[in-house]
């Protein structure tokens, strides 16, 4: 079941999935001046069996100016450096995302991919929040959101993160302590399309049980 809405938006924060549940779709979007090849897939789909999950279909972009040329999906290592890529660095995660049953890793980039990835999430997907560059967490409760099905409708739980500019008049008396697994709270909102994530930051984020770090390179 696809989630009806985007994960919640937090001022000066952005979110990221550590792994993608089976059923997740990623639009095959191309950057300006490029388009999907005629016979190309509209989206990649996370599929799998009990032991292994992977992305079906491949996204391929071609120059809008040329009709017949198709480019390879897998970029060369030096090309990868100049793209916007999400490099997952989560050494302290309880479960390695690659081995999480029923989940796919972040798909590798394809050549001439759009700068923003548009995911269609499914029920059960969890995303993690962090403050964008230049901001830090004034408050961080459970800094994740999960797409849940309630009374036949999907909704995202609310992440508890308040980001403040480093130049603002905040007082940070001490480092944050490890986050314990939280109890729930009544939802004030039953919200709950298509999700865009554009990570162009380098910062630290606390997941529910452990601290995990993910970075992205500037394009």
């Amino acid at each position: 079941e696809l989630c009806d809405d985007d994960p919640p938006e937090i001022p000066h924060a952005t979110f990221k999935a550590m792994a993608y549940k089976e059923g997740t779709m990623l639009n095959c979007e191309c950057k300006r001046g490029f388009r999907r090849i005629k016979s190309g897939s509209l989206y990649m789909l996370c599929t799998g069996n009990s032991s292994h999950s992977s992305w079906d279909n491949q996204c391929q972009c071609t120059s809008s100016a040329t009709r017949n040329t198709t480019k390879q999906v897998t970029p060369q290592p030096e090309e990868q450096k100049e793209r916007k890529t999400t490099e997952m660095q989560s050494p302290m995660q309880p479960v390695d995302q690659a081995s999480l049953p029923g989940h796919c890793r972040e798909p590798p980039p394809w050549e001439n991919e759009a700068t923003e990835r548009i995911y269609h999430f499914v029920v059960g997907q969890m995303v993690y929040y962090q403050c964008v560059q230049g901001y830090r967490a004034l408050h961080r409760g459970p800094a994740e959101s999960v797409c849940k099905m309630t009374h036949g409708k999907t909704r995202w739980t609310q992440p508890q993160l308040i980001c403040t500019g480093e130049m603002e008049t905040s007082q940070f008396p001490g480092e944050e302590k490890p986050q314990a697994s939280p109890e729930g709270r009544p939802e004030s909102e039953t919200s709950c399309l298509v999700t865009t994530t554009d990570f162009q930051i380098q910062t630290e984020m606390a997941a529910t049980m452990e601290t995990s770090i993910f970075t992205t390179e500037y394009q």
């Epitope: 938006e9 937090i10 408050h139 992440p159 508890q160 308040i162 603002e168 008396p173």
Partner: antibody, heavy 118, light 107 residues
Framework: EVQLVQSGAEVKKPGATVKISCKVS????????MHWVQQAPGKGLEWMGV????????NYNQKFKGRVTITADTSTDTAYMELSSLRSEDTAVYYC???????????WGQGTLVTVSS | DIQMTQSPSSLSASVGDRVTITCKAS??????LSWFQQKPGKAPKTLIY???RLVSGVPSRFSGSGSGQDYTLTISSLQPEDMATYYC?????????FGQGTKLEIK
């Protein structure tokens, strides 16, 4: 059921200090930040500051020029707002309110009237 | 600090009327704006957040719109129970700032 219960009305003399409490129940106290809002009689709302109940971080409205201190006691699930060097224009109702994820102030205390009079 | 200029400061309208209240921020607040309703002697209640998202349980006659610096609260068909003071709030940057309020009276 989520509840924020504030301490009772106070009458203070100019120059004095008042400390208002806000006891919460119905959710995990350290998950949600706590804000304080001032409302003078017949006037609008003024944000005073916020505390992270999780780590004690604070952010204050400089309009109150260092006179406000917000604290939290996780052992009693209670937040406090202390306002010092009181003057007559501090006569107001003070509210505590939780910040809930992507919008602030979903749950409010009932308000505490502080009267500053000589 | 971000200034929020709310207008009108008061208005009188009849039951069934369409009512609009506006808020202008002194800078772009990227739609991080809430609308509150406050009745005498009561704490404020959130109606709208993120400029246009209705809080669960709030009647659908309330709606919000706007982006950048300019925002609007609309009551599509005024009801007697809507008599209250309405405030906007920006929560894009600290310190959070409220509009001055709009007192809505029923003719």
């Amino acid at each position: 059921e989520v509840q924020l219960v504030q301490s009772g009305a106070e009458v203070k003399k100019p120059g004095a200090t008042v400390k208002i409490s806000c006891k919460v129940s119905g959710y995990t106290f350290t998950d949600y930040a706590m804000h304080w809002v001032q409302q003078a009689p017949g006037k609008g709302l003024e944000w005073m500051g916020v505390i992270s109940t999780y780590n004690g971080n604070t952010n204050y409205n400089q309009k109150f020029k260092g006179r406000v201190t917000i604290t939290a006691d996780t052992s009693t699930d209670t937040a406090y707002m202390e306002l010092s060097s009181l003057r007559s224009e501090d006569t107001a109702v003070y509210y505590c309110a939780t910040s809930y994820g992507n919008y602030p102030f979903d749950y409010w205390g009932q308000g505490t009237l502080v009267t500053v009079s000589s | 600090d971000i200034q929020m200029t709310q207008s009108p400061s008061s208005l009188s309208a009849s039951v069934g009327d369409r009512v609009t209240i506006t808020c202008k921020a002194s800078q772009d607040i990227t739609s991080y704006l809430s609308w509150f309703q406050q009745k005498p002697g009561k704490a404020p209640k959130t109606l709208i957040y993120r400029a246009n998202r209705l809080v669960s349980g709030v009647p659908s006659r309330f709606s919000g719109s706007g982006s950048g610096q300019d925002y609007t609260l609309t009551i599509s068909s005024l009801q007697p129970e809507d008599m209250a003071t309405y405030y906007c709030l920006q929560y894009d940057e600290f310190p959070y700032t409220f509009g001055q309020g709009t007192k809505l009276e029923i003719k």
